[in-house]
C-alpha cells in the first residue's frame, strides 16, 4: 500500500518527501532532496511573492499608468504588489482599481449626500421641499430656502429645488 | 561563508530595555531572512522574532509580541532585536541566525543554517 504522506502548512510535497516552501519575497530555484533543503532566491528589483510558494518565477510589480488616471498609492516590496489609486478628482471603478473615472458633480436640484472618494463616486439626492441646490457641484449640499418671514418680508417668488425663494418689500394696505 | 556576530547583551533591571545587534559578513546575498532566538538554561532553543530578507515582514513569538522589535540595516548588514519592558523570564543567551536558502518557516530553528555564538541577556533586579 502507498504510503499517505502529509506536508506542513509551509511545506509541500516533491517525490515523496516534504520540501520547505520558499519564503515571501522568493521563489524556487531548486527542489530539496535527501541531503538539501530547498533552493530559493530573493525576488529581483520591480518583482514580488505574496506566498509562501514553490513558483520558479516572481510576479511583476503592478504599473500604475497616468494615461489611464492612476497613480501609486504603495509602492510595492519584495512581498507585495504595488497598489494604484486614481489622480485627485477621480475614484476606482473596481476593487483593482484598474480604471479611474472623473467624480459626478451633482446637478442643480441635487445635494451632495456623501462627497466622492478615492473608491467611490458622489451620492447626490433630490433636494426636498424647502431646499435648493443652483449649481452643478462635487460638494454643495442642498440649502434652505430663505425665510421671508423671518426678514419681515413677503414671497414674490416661490423657491423650487433648483432656486431659492425671492423675497421683497410687504406691499401696503391700502 | 556566512559569519554573524552578536553584540549588545547585559544585565538590566526589569522593565528596562535592551538593543542587540547581529552583524552578518560572507554571503552571496546583502541581506537574507534573519531570525534571534534564546535558549535558557535546561531549556529548549526558542524562536523569538524573524525578519524576511527584505525586511519587509516581521514574525514574533506570542511571548515577545508588543514588547519587542525586530529591524535591519541592509547596508550596514546588521539586524537588531529591541526589547522593552524586559521581564526575568526573558533570561536567556540570545542567538541570531541566518537562512541562505530562503526557504522554510521563519520560527523553527532548522530552517536556519548559520548561526552567531550567543549574547547572554540577564535581567534581574
Known amino acids: 500500500l502507498g504510503q499517505c504522506v502529509t506536508c506542513s502548512d509551509k511545506q509541500y510535497l516533491h517525490d515523496g518527501q516534504c520540501c520547505d516552501l520558499c519564503q515571501p519575497g522568493s521563489r524556487l530555484t531548486s527542489h530539496c532532496t535527501a541531503l538539501e533543503k530547498t533552493q530559493c532566491h530573493p525576488c529581483d528589483s520591480g518583482e514580488f511573492s505574496a506566498q509562501w510558494n514553490r513558483e520558479i518565477r516572481c510576479h511583476q510589480h503592478r504599473h500604475c499608468e497616468p494615461n489611464q488616471g492612476l497613480r501609486v498609492k504603495k509602492e510595492g516590496t519584495a512581498e507585495s504588489d504595488t497598489v494604484c489609486t486614481c489622480k485627485e478628482g477621480q475614484h476606482c471603478t473596481s476593487k483593482d482599481c484598474e480604471a479611474c473615472a472623473q467624480h459626478t458633480p451633482c446637478i442643480p436640484g441635487f445635494g451632495v449626500m456623501e462627497m466622492a472618494t478615492e473608491t467611490t463616486d458622489t451620492v447626490c439626492h433630490p433636494c426636498p421641499v424647502g431646499f435648493f441646490s443652483n449649481q452643478s457641484s462635487l460638494f454643495e449640499k442642498c440649502y434652505p430656502w430663505t425665510s421671508c418671514e423671518d426678514k419681515n418680508l413677503e414671497v414674490l417668488q416661490k423657491g423650487t429645488s433648483q432656486t431659492n425663494v425671492i423675497c421683497g418689500l410687504k406691499s401696503r394696505m391700502r | 561563508q556566512v559569519q554573524l556576530v552578536e553584540s549588545g547583551g547585559g544585565l538590566v533591571q526589569p522593565g528596562g530595555s535592551l538593543r542587540l545587534s547581529c552583524a552578518a559578513s560572507g554571503g552571496t546575498f546583502s541581506s537574507y531572512p534573519m531570525g534571534w532566538f534564546r535558549q535558557a538554561p535546561g531549556k529548549e532553543r526558542e524562536f523569538v522574532a524573524a525578519?524576511?530578507?527584505?525586511?519587509?515582514?516581521?514574525y514574533y513569538a506570542d511571548s515577545t509580541k508588543g514588547r519587542f522589535t525586530i529591524s535591519r540595516d541592509s547596508a550596514r548588514n546588521t539586524v537588531y532585536l529591541q526589547m522593552n519592558s524586559l521581564k526575568p523570564e526573558d533570561t536567556a543567551v540570545y542567538y541570531c541566525?541566518?537562512?541562505?536558502?530562503?526557504?522554510?518557516?521563519?520560527?523553527?530553528?532548522?530552517?536556519?543554517?548559520?548561526w552567531g555564538q550567543g549574547t547572554q541577556v540577564t535581567v534581574s533586579s
Open positions: 525578519i524576511s530578507w527584505s525586511g519587509g515582514s516581521t
Open positions: 541566525a541566518a537562512n541562505t536558502h530562503f526557504s522554510g518557516a521563519f520560527e523553527h530553528a532548522r530552517t536556519y543554517d548559520y
